[in-house]
């Protein structure tokens, strides 16, 4: 019994004066609490608590369920206790079958004994199954058996408390351990699509998938910069005990332009939070935007190839595409394909492959594309660079020598005089007249230049060279003439190609 110094309040004293008392089933329990300031007796075992305001606690015929802790308390709040075991060979355990374990924490299997003198107080698996190898426990006859550091793997474990009584193993009723997992990571969240593009009136539906170890993970769809509660529908599945999946689907049945924005799927558990966003853009009608990948004015050399390439955004998806030249539609030589295989892709590429272009194939090449809402087009002006071609070289009746050349870019015509039989014509002759003529071909065809010189200026035998040139190449034509007395003899024109 406790002892304190005089003057100070002291705890009550209990008779019999021992910490533990063993009585047989059917016998009397008589406990006396002595204290001038007696308040109450309290009895506790498992789920039961009883009070008694009499200073003597009497149970005439003790039962196993009277096993427990009897505490006497005085007006100063000081107390003293005795633990009573009511030995009943037919009921060795008192049992509270609820058994919850928190992962990584200890948990108590509540099967206190009615007889402290039985041996080998321990846990056993149900139906003779062994306990997990790493399961450690500490028995306490007054409280039960403490399982140390509960693991997830113990979930749904069926157990019995066990003792040996007269050489035989006796089992309690079964316990099933329910383990609540510890959150050791944030939830895993993903979204069905990262962005959505819709026309007004269309349905917007997006699904967020949340994965975690238990259904107690919290999740919600939120509109960024808004507190409005969004309407969600849920589906959920348990893929085993600690693998939970939820699908939260957000739907706007008829989207409006002002519904555009960023929507966040947010999830959290006691470890932390995670989120993923999707962007909604609602347009009042569809659109097509075309972006040329090369300059829309194209210069290409005769006989070479060129690819006319456009990228375009189309929503809804494009229905008709065509390339046109001179009012004719190309049936081949072009390809059209999506920029990516992503299901939300709205960007496409179209390529027209022009091969071994001729000088006559310059002009406007037009790409046309349409969807259910709009049409769009882009034009490429293609110029074919050709080396000059001398179309005519004549002596006119008025004594003029005339050279007409065609090419692109516009050719320049220079005149040279070669005295005698010299091949090198270095002395340049200034033309009397230079004109650019209107071509009868398409506006992107060759440009025609006419240049004339006065042949009367020449007083000696020789050769006159007409040289037409541009960035691509040059071509020459020659006039040979000779003097007989004061008269010029025949003039023989001929051309000489100079690469």
């Amino acid at each position: 019994q406790p002892s304190v110094s005089p003057g100070e309040p002291s705890p009550p004293s209990i008779h019999p004066g021992k910490s533990d008392l063993i009585v047989r089933v059917g016998d009397e329990i008589r406990l006396l609490c002595t204290d001038p300031g007696f308040v109450k007796w309290t009895f506790e075992i498992l789920d039961e608590t009883n009070e008694n305001k009499q200073n003597e606690w009497i149970t005439e015929k003790a039962e196993a369920t009277n096993t427990g802790k009897y505490t006497c308390t005085n007006k100063h709040g000081l107390s003293n206790s005795i633990y009573v075991f009511v030995r009943d060979p037919a009921k060795l355990f008192l049992v509270d079958r609820s058994l919850y374990g928190k992962e990584d924490n200890d948990t108590l299997v509540r099967c206190p004994l009615t007889d402290p003198e039985v041996t080998n107080y321990s846990l056993k698996g149900c139906q003779g199954k062994p306990l997990p190898k790493d399961l450690r426990f500490i028995p306490d006859p007054k409280a039960g058996i403490m399982i140390k550091s509960v693991k997830r793997a113990y979930h749904r474990l069926c157990l019995h408390c066990s003792v040996d009584q007269e050489g035989k193993s006796v089992l309690s009723e079964k316990f099933i351990l329910k383990v609540r997992p510890a959150f050791k990571a944030v939830p895993v969240v993903s979204v069905s699509k990262a962005s959505y593009l819709l026309r007004e009136g269309e349905e917007f539906t997006v699904t967020c998938t949340i994965k975690d170890v238990s259904s107690s993970v919290y999740s919600t769809w939120k509109r960024e910069n808004s507190q409005t509660k969004l309407q969600e529908k849920y589906n959920s599945w348990h893929h085993g005990d600690f693998n939970y999946e939820r699908q939260a689907t957000l739907t706007i049945s008829s989207a409006r332009v002002n519904d555009s924005g960023v929507f966040m799927c947010y999830a959290n558990n006691t470890f932390g939070s995670a989120n993923v966003t999707t962007t909604l853009e609602v347009v009042d009608k569809g659109f097509i935007n075309i972006f040329p990948m090369i300059n829309t004015t194209v210069f290409v050399n005769d006989g070479e190839n060129v690819d006319l390439i456009v990228e375009y955004e189309a929503f809804p998806k494009p229905e008709h595409q065509q390339w046109i030249y001179m009012n004719r539609t190309f049936t081949d030589k072009w390809e059209d394909y999506p920029k990516s295989e992503n299901e939300s892709n709205i960007r496409y590429v179209s390529e027209l492959h022009l091969t071994r272009l001729k000088g006559t194939e310059g002009g406007t090449y037009t790409f046309l594309v349409s969807n259910s809402d709009v049409n769009a087009a882009i034009a490429f002006n293609v110029y074919v660079n050709t080396k000059p071609e001398i179309l005519t070289y004549d002596r006119l009746v008025n004594g003029m020598l005339q050279c007409v050349a065609a090419g692109f870019p516009e050719p320049t015509i220079d005149w040279y005089f070669c005295p005698g039989t010299e091949q090198r014509c270095s002395a340049s002759v200034l033309p009397v007249d230079v004109q650019t003529l209107n071509s009868s071909g398409p506006p992107f065809g060759k440009l025609v230049v006419q240049s004339s010189i006065d042949s009367s200026a020449f007083k000696h035998n020789g050769t006159v060279e007409c040289k037409a040139y541009n960035d691509v190449g040059k071509t020459s034509a020659y006039f040979n003439f000779a003097f007989k007395g004061n008269n010029k003899e025949q003039i023989h024109p001929h051309t000489l190609f100079t690469p």
């Epitope: 498992l46 039961e48 009883n50 609820s98 919850y100 609540r180 259904s215 107690s216 348990h238 006691t270």
Partner: antibody, heavy 116, light 107 residues
Framework: QVQLVQSGAEVKKPGSSVKVSCKAS????????LSWVRQAPGQGLEWMGG????????DYAQKFQGRVTITADESTSTAYMELSSLRSEDTAVYYC?????????WGQGTLVTVSS | DIQMTQSPSSLSASVGDRVTITCRAS??????LAWYQQKPGKAPKLLIY???SLQSGVPSRFSGSGSGTDFTLTISSLQPEDFAVYYC?????????FGQGTKVEIK
């Protein structure tokens, strides 16, 4: 011997919150779980969520997540259920029950009426 | 979530009759099933847990059986105080879910 005693009936306006209490006596509070189950008039039973006081964390049915908060005060052996953003369809009898899985003891129920 | 379907939704019987109520789960729930009795204006009362274990203080005329997805509550000899609504409940996975109830009425 275990008793769960709930707070009295409540009449609430839509959009408001209600907090119902459940005091446990005659047993050890912290080692047991305490759940909340509701029953709309003429309808079946619906588990809302539960708490194991000694663990400190609650589990909720997805339907109520974000609107319901379940707490426990071990010092007074009392559990609480707060439901926010009330709507007319939340009119029901709300029961507290001992357990997280099966429920061996029940409170007497608290009628919550949501009406404008 | 796991769906629980009870049948029948109601039945009429006389005192002394043997009554059987069935409950089907939308997926395997092992034996994590409880049965409750509810009388008008009262809280439910636990009758059976773990599919077949009789709760302390419940008369032995109540019994439960089944495993996996199909379960049965049997009242071997119906007594006047047994007229009530009976609910099954799964607790294999949280959230715990209840059947819609079976009303047992006097014939």
């Amino acid at each position: 011997q275990v008793q769960l005693v709930q707070s009295g009936a409540e009449v609430k306006k839509p959009g408001s919150s209600v907090k119902v209490s459940c005091k446990a006596s005659g047993g050890t509070f912290s080692s047991h779980a305490l759940s909340w189950v509701r029953q709309a008039p003429g309808q079946g039973l619906e588990w809302m969520g539960g708490i194991i006081p000694s663990f400190g964390t609650a589990d909720y049915a997805q339907k109520f997540q974000g609107r319901v908060t379940i707490t426990a005060d071990e010092s007074t052996s009392t559990a609480y259920m707060e439901l926010s953003s009330l709507r007319s369809e939340d009119t029901a009898v709300y029961y507290c029950a001992r357990g997280l899985y099966d429920f061996d003891y029940w409170g007497q129920g608290t009628l919550v009426t949501v009406s404008s | 979530d796991i769906q629980m379907t009870q049948s029948p939704s109601s039945l009429s019987a006389s005192v002394g009759d043997r009554v059987t109520i069935t409950c089907r789960a939308s997926q395997d729930i092992s034996q994590d099933l409880a049965w409750y009795q509810q009388k008008p204006g009262k809280a439910p009362k636990l009758l059976i847990y773990d599919a077949s274990s009789l709760q302390s203080g419940v008369p032995s005329r109540f019994s439960g059986s089944g495993s996996g997805t199909d379960f049965t509550l049997t009242i071997s000899s119906l007594q006047p105080e047994d007229f009530a609504v009976y609910y099954c409940q799964q607790y294999y996975y949280l959230p715990s879910t209840f059947g819609q109830g079976t009303k047992v009425e006097i014939k």
